[in-house]
Interface confidence: low
């Protein structure tokens, strides 16, 4: 039902209610008589200056003479309403103040209001390479000869030959040489939506060029590559031969959700198939730093470890919400999950055996495994005080660094040791 309230619903409070949720609803307080009718009601939606708050009115019927709803944001003149506007209001600049005022002596005559708000378009991407195992490592570690991912994917596809072992590029029978210029979008290989095995090899190229200097995130939401097929993601506008190869995907990547983050504001995605390939290909999305896909949510200020640092560095999908893995640096995607009390994080995905266990922020990334599956010690953007962050995003005790014995799985606690500590 379109009017059904599915977001947090905020009553009138004094002093003004500060709303920290990314989305919610507001309504005029129920009034029985003039004595219980508040003269003023103010809500403050907190956001950063990069955000836009969208206000959608399910209902707005106020008595225009005595009732009024005003909306104020930093980059917008004051908006005063007593009837619903024809389309949603988009208020840029972050903080939005919504005030309901009533100047009458008796109970208000209008039918009241019901609105929903949502905060959109906040995202910054990190200069990282995403491994096939979903870990993130610094982009400078790509093709540096060291397995920083732990699964070797940061060193895969680093051949000087951009298309090793692939046949010459033929003219594709289906249109697939595409330039995409939007801030975000969806694209897929020609056979993905209508499976059709082609008798000859295919070569397709997508140039992602939003005319924006910020980096891109390319997310392969579905991968079904045939044996011998490949997808290559290159940084910059191409041609591939002169561009930096960021990632190569083969049939070994099938079934994985892979995200590639570019170093520049452009990318080329090349898709190559062998004759009679049995793969469907891929479906992918891309977006510019500063924008989330419409169906994703922005990471933001949460109560998790590291809140206040690296805010809004990512977006997360509905599938990544409450799955036990921190996709946001501050754990926004794992906050307020079913089965966990406020301020706790789930060990595993909702509905899994580990989902009933919940942990506090203090239990995260402290080299003391709390969750049975170790979820509290994975994907650590930060470590608790007294701990050292390994390159593989796990934490070990700081006192164990450079003691001559590797404690990180990748041995990174023994790298860059300018001196050797005496053995205890």
């Amino acid at each position: 039902h379109p009017d059904r309230i599915i977001f947090p619903n905020h009553a009138c409070e004094d002093p003004p209610a500060v709303l920290l949720e990314v989305q919610g609803t507001l309504q005029r307080p129920l009034v029985r008589d003039s004595r219980t009718s508040p003269a003023n009601c103010t809500w403050l939606i907190l956001g950063s200056k990069e955000q836009t708050v969208t206000i959608r009115f399910q209902k707005l019927h106020l008595a225009c003479g005595s009732e009024r709803l005003t909306l104020r944001s930093p980059l917008q003149p004051l908006i005063s309403l007593c009837e619903a506007p024809p389309s949603p209001l988009q208020l840029p600049g972050g903080n939005v103040t919504i005030t309901y005022s009533y100047a009458g002596a008796r109970a208000p005559m209008g039918q009241g209001f019901l609105l929903s708000y949502s905060q959109d378009w906040l995202m910054c991407l990190q200069e990282e390479f995403q491994c096939l195992n979903h870990r993130c490592v610094s982009a400078v570690q790509r093709c540096d000869g060291v397995d920083a991912c732990g699964d070797g994917s940061d060193e895969a596809g680093c051949s000087s030959d951009p298309f090793p072992g692939l046949t010459p590029r033929p003219v594709p029978s289906l249109p697939c040489n595409v330039t995409l210029e939007d801030f975000y979008g969806v694209f897929s290989s020609p056979g993905y939506t209508h499976l059709a095995s082609v008798s000859h090899p295919q070569s397709c190229h997508w140039l992602l060029d939003p005319h924006d200097g910020r980096r891109l995130a390319v997310r392969f939401t579905a991968l079904d590559l045939g044996f011998g097929d490949a997808v290559h993601v290159y940084d910059g506008p191409g041609p591939p031969e002169s561009s930096r190869l960021l990632r190569s995907l083969t049939h070994f990547s099938n079934g994985k959700a892979v995200t590639v983050e570019t170093l520049s504001g452009q990318a080329v995605v090349s898709y190559h198939t062998v004759a009679w390939s049995n793969g469907r290909g891929f479906n992918a999305t891309y977006h510019v730093r500063g924008y989330c896909l419409p169906w994703d949510r922005p990471c933001g200020l949460g109560s998790g470890l590291g809140a206040g640092e690296g805010l809004g560095e990512r977006c997360y999908s509905e599938a990544q919400r409450c799955d036990g893995s921190w996709d946001c640096a501050d754990g926004t995607d794992e906050e307020d999950c079913p089965g966990c009390p406020p301020g706790h994080f789930p060990c595993g995905a909702a509905g899994t055996s580990g989902a009933t266990a919940c942990y506090l922020p203090a239990d995260r990334c402290n080299y003391q495994t709390f969750c049975a599956d170790g979820a509290d010690e994975r994907r650590c953007r930060h470590c608790q005080p007294g701990n050292f962050r390994c390159r593989d995003e796990k934490c070990v005790y700081e006192t164990w660094v450079c003691d001559g014995q590797p404690d990180c799985a990748d041995g990174s606690d023994e790298w860059d040791c300018s001196y050797v500590l005496p053995r205890k």
């Epitope: 249109p175 595409v178 330039t179 995409l180 975000y184 979008g185 939003p210």
Partner: antibody, heavy 116, light 107 residues
């Protein structure tokens, strides 16, 4: 050869509606974002709206937001602009343009006159 | 919104002259700027994109330069067919915005 052919313009009263069409040929229409740009008589160019390859995202200039709707039918290689609640200030030549940002091909334009 | 300001609004020149038109953005747009030419009664035509890259089929007498907030379109030797109105446009931020135009007339 790339061709964009607008149609649907004409005289309409304030508050009225019009639907503009843009028939595309000579390129793979479904592979490109498309845009509408308008030009009031004797004035400069004003971007109106754009639409992504698969019908999303759609974005609008503030001056038309809530009144105009951009859409596309990739099977017919056609771009549309539904214009409602038209105002005198919407009087202009409306061009459809290939791509979302860098308008490398334009139609010849269709004139929309809003007058009582 | 990013405002684009062109100067001059109009200029008179003779065939063979070197003509320079400037465009200023209200905030940095890196090298993301497009230039268009429009003749009376005709649709605009893309000349330059990414500040300095010549669109296919455009004569080499047209060139563009600049980055950040200040950009220039130069016609090295004005030809009769170049008398038109020229617009700059920023493609980096929604809403996309154009300059007000520079009309190049025959002296």
């Amino acid at each position: 050869e790339v061709q964009l052919l607008e149609s649907g313009g004409g005289l309409v009263q304030p508050g009225g509606s019009l639907r503009l069409s843009c028939a595309a040929s000579g390129f793979t229409f479904s592979s490109y974002a498309m845009s509408w740009v308008r030009q009031a008589p004797g004035k400069g160019l004003e971007w109106v709206s754009q639409i992504g390859t698969m019908g999303r995202p759609t974005t609008y200039a503030d001056s038309v937001k809530g009144r105009f709707t951009i859409s596309r039918d990739n099977s017919k290689n056609t771009l549309y602009l539904q214009m409602n609640s038209l105002r005198a200030e919407d009087t202009a030549v409306y061009y459809c343009a290939k791509s979302g940002k860098k308008f490398d091909y334009w139609g010849q334009g269709t004139l929309v006159t809003v007058s009582s | 919104d990013i405002q684009m300001t062109q100067s001059p609004s109009s200029l008179s020149a003779s065939v063979g002259d070197r003509v320079t038109i400037t465009c200023r953005a209200s905030q940095s747009i890196s090298s993301y700027l497009n230039w268009y030419q429009q003749k009376p009664g005709k649709a605009p035509k893309l000349l330059i994109y990414r500040a300095s890259r010549l669109q296919s089929g455009v004569p080499s007498r047209f060139s563009g330069s600049g980055s950040g907030t200040d950009f220039t379109l130069t016609i090295s030797s004005l030809q009769p067919e170049d008398f038109a109105t020229y617009y700059c446009q920023q493609p980096t931020s929604l809403p996309l915005t154009f300059g007000q135009g520079t009309k190049v007339e025959i002296k």
